[in-house]
Every structure is written in C-alpha cells, then in structure tokens.
C-alpha cells in the first residue's frame, strides 16, 4: 500500500480467483484512543472498533472511503483505491490501446517544434468518475523538470457502437535546449483513477522523434505565361522553430486529380516554391518535414488548381 | 578545406556532405515500425557516445560567437562514429548486405571529419569504448542503436553547417 495523495491510498492487488488478497491496517488520525468505530462509504454498518482497523482487500467491494468516528463525530478518512495485477500484468482498462505506432500505445505525444513544448493525448470510453494527473521529466535517474498543465477533455467521437473521449495535456520542458542533441528521453507518467480503480501509464520519447510540423502556410499559385505550369509557393508555418536557416524543413508537393485513382505527381524540394503542371479539377498540396531528421510529415496544406 | 584553430570551415562543402550523411544514416536504418531500442537497456552503449550538448556552442548564437567549440565537438563525434562503423560491430557477423549504405556512411563520416581537420592538425578525440558483443543478435541490436544515435548526431551537425553556410560564409 502506498499514499497517492493526502488520505488517498493505493492497494496493489495481485488478483486471481480465490486469491487471499492484501491485508491492510488502517489507523485513525486522532489522539483519541477509546470509543472509535469504523464504517465504509455511506453505510452505517460498523466494521470494527479501536484506533486501528485490519481489513483483507480481495476485490473492489473492499475498496472505498473508510471513516473512523467517535460519538457521531468524524475523526478521519482513508480512501482506498485498487491497482490490480492479473497474470503478472497491471491492468490497463481505463485507457484504450491506440495501436499506433505499435500495440500497447496508450499515450501519444507530438511536438510542433524543438522548443520543448509537447502535447500528449489518450482515449477512453469512460465518461464519468474519471480523473487524470500528469507528471513529466527529462530522464529518470536524475530528472530535469518538465511542467505539465491539467489534462482536459479535448474531443468526443462516436464510431458505430463506440463513444470515445479524448483527453490531452500540454507540457513544457523547463530548461529546453532546442539546438542540442537529446541524450536523455522525456518521461511522461499519467495516473488515471476511475471510481476506485487506479492505473498508471507511461511513455518515453525524444522530442526529435515526436516532431510533427504544422502544415506550410500561405500556399499560393502563380500561373506561368503561355504554359500549363504554375509556380506554387508557400511559407514555413509560424509554429516552426527559428531561425529557419538552422531549423530547416523539406517539402513534398503533390498534384492530385479529383479521383483518388488518378496518378499522383510528387515533387520533393528544400525550397519554398516549385513549378508543377496543374491539371483541370486537380488540387495542389504541400506538406513539411524536418530536413535532417525523419520524424512525421505535417498534414497537407491544399489549394485547388482552378 | 576547413582549417581548425581560428579560421572558418568550408561551410558549403560541409553542409552538402552533412546533408548526405543524414540521408545515408536514414537509409542505413529506416524507421523500422518505430522500433523502440531504448527499451533494450542501452546504458553500456549509447551513454558513451559523444552528444552535442547545450553548452557546446552549436546553437545559432554560439556559432556566431565562436564556432570552434561546436566544430571541435562535431569532429570528435564524427571520428567516434567513424571508428564504430569500422569496428567488428559492423564488420562481423551477420554480414552487411553488399549494397548496404553503411560503407558509404563510413566513408562520408571520414570525409567530413577530414574537411573539418586536415592532416597535421589535431583536436582531442574521444576514446572509443571497447564493445565486442559475442552474439550476432547482440551485434545486430548494437548496430541499430548506433545508427539511431548517429541519425540524431548528424541531424544537429547538418543544422550547424546549413546555418553556417547561410550566415557565416565569407
């Protein structure tokens, strides 16, 4: 058993059918010695008397808020949560496995640049009685500070018989060094509590591996005289790291016909313009990627050929 | 050619070669399904690798003030990786495929390090750790880790030379 926060305790339960459970001793936080009784949650049933109460925690029915009283007055509370292990594996029932980029991916994180700011998000199908707490650091043995805000509900999606809730959090490394080569990964730890169930989730990454630039901005077409060719131009997104001579992007320009089956023409360039042939009813799209490190491409920025 | 000490390197040549290094490093080890090699306990390998750190002067301001600190650090790393790629980690079993980019990568690391430091001039180089994994699978894992680490190193080096070519060239 360990303390999650004041008066809230997590009991680690290795569960299997007929498991003996965990013996837990609760102590009433009071100088009083006599006449103390114990109850669980809203029930008035007396579970025991005395300054300490020994319970056997076998299942969620044994968790909850234990209260000690004396003569009708509440002396102290202890909220017991369960962290369940089955077949040697801690439960991961609260969050959905996003399966991208690999199985058992519960937390996904992205950064728009090298400033040390990043966003993580996760999915759940639970709509109520749910709290999250996020901590982060750079490295684990001698951790350097990363400050995370509060996790907030950022989206709700209905997919057939499933309703999903997306939560996200923004974090900022306290002393970020955008130009340095990271040697210690960022660690993100999420505590999730649903009713009386405690679970924790972790992710470890380098900022360079979660970079996804915003799409290029100000995408424009300039027709070339007496030609089907157009000059496409664009700019670096505002959110990208500066100076651009140092933090450079590379771009992919795509000409796509109305039909998905039509052949796509693609051009790769380090410049912020390109000359392409504009077909009728086609659209031109441009996306960006770090020039020197193959992290994610941005989403496409698009304009119609007409 | 670059001349260490006080004068400037051939920024444009360095830029071109470092960008080529980035391409080669990624073709030698593409993102294999986001293979997370940090889970494999890599203290003994990649902790000894020279990283370009915050105080090494490789940021735009540091390069403007005095690029020599940064160039020395990059040179140190290039020599380190050049030695690693020439060691039995890469020459031993399992053999690399004949068309593997590792050979080109090795030659380009040497080429860039020579651009930064011609014969007769010596910056201090870092001692290469003695890593001789006994099992072929260990060697394979070590190769992946070294290449992942090299990708990060050459990315920073390429940014340095691109910025130098754009802002510090005579």
């Amino acid at each position: 058993i360990w303390e999650l926060k004041k008066d809230v305790y997590v009991v680690e339960l290795d569960w299997y059918p007929d498991a003996p459970g965990e013996m837990v001793v609760l102590t009433c936080d009071t100088p009083e010695e006599d006449g103390i009784t114990w109850t669980l949650d809203q029930s008035s049933e007396v579970l025991g008397s005395g300054k300490t109460l020994t319970i056997q925690v076998k299942e969620f029915g044994d968790a909850g808020q234990y209260t000690c009283h004396k003569g009708g007055e509440v002396l102290s509370h202890s909220l017991l949560l369960l962290h369940k292990k089955e077949d040697g594996i801690w439960s991961t029932d609260i969050l959905k496995d996003q399966k991208e980029p690999k199985n058992k991916t519960f937390l996904r994180c992205e950064a728009k640049n090298y400033s040390g700011r990043f966003t993580c998000w996760w999915l759940t199908t639970i709509s109520t009685d749910l709290t999250f707490s996020v901590k982060s650091s750079r490295g684990s043995s001698d951790p350097q500070g990363v400050t995370c805000g509060a996790a907030t509900l950022s989206a709700e999606r209905v997919r057939g018989d499933n309703k999903e809730y997306e939560y996200s959090v923004e974090c900022q490394e306290d002393s970020a060094c955008p130009a340095a080569e990271e040697s210690l990964p960022i660690e993100v730890m999420v505590d999730a509590v649903h009713k009386l169930k405690y679970e924790n989730y972790t992710s470890s990454f380098f900022i360079r591996d979660i970079i996804k630039p915003d799409p290029p901005k100000n995408l424009q077409l300039k027709p070339l005289k007496n030609s089907r060719q157009v000059e496409v131009s664009w700019e670096y997104p505002d959110t990208w790291s500066t100076p651009h001579s140092y933090f450079s992007l590379t771009f992919c320009v795509q000409v796509q016909g109305k039909s998905k089956r039509e052949k796509k023409d693609r051009v790769f360039t380090d410049k912020t313009s390109a000359t392409v042939i504009c077909r009728k009813n086609a659209s031109i799209s441009v996306r960006a990627q770090d020039r020197y490190y193959s992290s994610s491409w941005s989403e496409w920025a698009s304009v119609p050929c007409s | 050619r670059a001349v260490p000490g006080g004068s400037s390197p051939a920024w444009t040549q360095c830029q071109q070669l470092s960008q080529k290094l980035c391409t080669l490093a990624w073709s030698a080890h593409p993102l294999v399904g986001h293979m997370d090699l940090r889970e494999e306990g890599d203290e003994e390998t990649t902790n000894d690798v020279p990283h370009i750190q915050c105080g090494d002067g490789c940021d735009p301001q540091g390069l403007r003030d005095n690029s020599q600190f940064c160039l020395q650090r990059i040179h140190q790393g290039l020599i380190f990786y050049e030695k690693l790629l020439g060691s039995d980690i890469f020459t031993g079993e399992p053999s690399l495929l004949p068309d593997s980019p590792v050979g080109q990568l090795h030659a380009s690391l040497l080429g860039l390090s020579q651009l930064l430091q011609p014969e007769g001039h010596h910056w201090e180089t870092q001692q290469i750790p003695s890593l001789s994994p006994s099992q072929p699978w260990q060697r394979l894992l070590l190769r992946f880790k070294i290449l992942r680490s090299l990708q990060a190193f050459v990315a920073v080096a390429a940014r340095v030379f691109a910025h130098g070519a754009a802002t510090l060239s005579p």
Epitope: P17, F60, G61, E86, D93, D161, N162, K163, L196 | -
Partner: nanobody
Framework: EVQLVESGGGVVQAGESLRLSCAAS????????MGWFRQAPGMEREFAAA????????YYADSVKGRFTISRDNAKNTVYLQMSSLKPEDTAVYYC????????????????WGQGTQVTVSS
C-alpha cells in the same frame, strides 16, 4: 447509456439446469465488466458471478461456485449464466448488471441493471 435485457428464467426441479441470457446494447458495451446478482423475496440483492470485459477472467460467490458458469460472447453482446445442480435456495429474481470495476461483488460498483428474470426451483 447501456440497456440490459435478461431472458431464460423459468420453473425447474431441484438438480436441473437453466441458462440465463443477458443481451446488452448501447455505447461501448464490450468495455463493461458484466455480473449476475439475485434477490430472493424479503432478502437483499446478492452477488452470484462476474466476468471481465475481455472474458478471460471470472469471479463467483462461494454459494454458486462449481455449479454456475458465467460466459460472454462479445460478438453478440450477450452474457450467459449457466446454472446446474439447482437448489430451492437458488429461487430468486436474477439481474444482469454492467460496470467497470472487476472483480466486485458489491452492487453499487455496477452502473447499469436489467429488469430481472424469475427463476423458481421447486423441490
């Protein structure tokens, strides 16, 4: 919202078997742990069995262990309670329940309940 509809109740002789079904519908039903409770006249509702949302783990009250088997078919969104060697003291209204805390034998850990199906075991 999750809707639960029980079926399969009836009158049987002691020693016989019966299979109860609980059809679940609504959002995210596959993510719920499912349980069966029962309530005899004048008694409190008591736990009988529960199954995890993956269907890989089951939990039983001592009074039914070895006689009752809980199972689920996630493709059909249905939970079953196979009852064998029935006794007169198994007579009760059987309720299907859905919740997110497994294992739990406490009724208030379950969020949704069916209307119940009557099982009568005569001697």
């Amino acid at each position: 919202e999750v809707q639960l509809v029980e079926s399969g109740g009836g009158v049987v002789q002691a020693g016989e078997s019966l299979r109860l079904s609980c059809a679940a519908s609504g959002y995210n039903v596959k993510d719920y742990e499912m349980g069966w409770f029962r309530q005899a006249p004048g008694m409190e509702r008591e736990f009988a069995a529960a199954i995890s949302w993956r269907g890989s783990s089951t939990y039983y009250a001592d009074s039914v262990k070895g006689r009752f088997t809980i199972s689920r078919d996630n493709a059909k969104n249905t939970v079953y309670l196979q009852m064998s060697s029935l006794k007169p003291e198994d007579t009760a209204v059987y309720y299907c329940a859905a919740g997110r805390l497994y294992p739990s034998s406490r009724s208030r850990d379950y969020d949704y309940w069916g209307q119940g199906t009557q099982v009568t075991v005569s001697s």
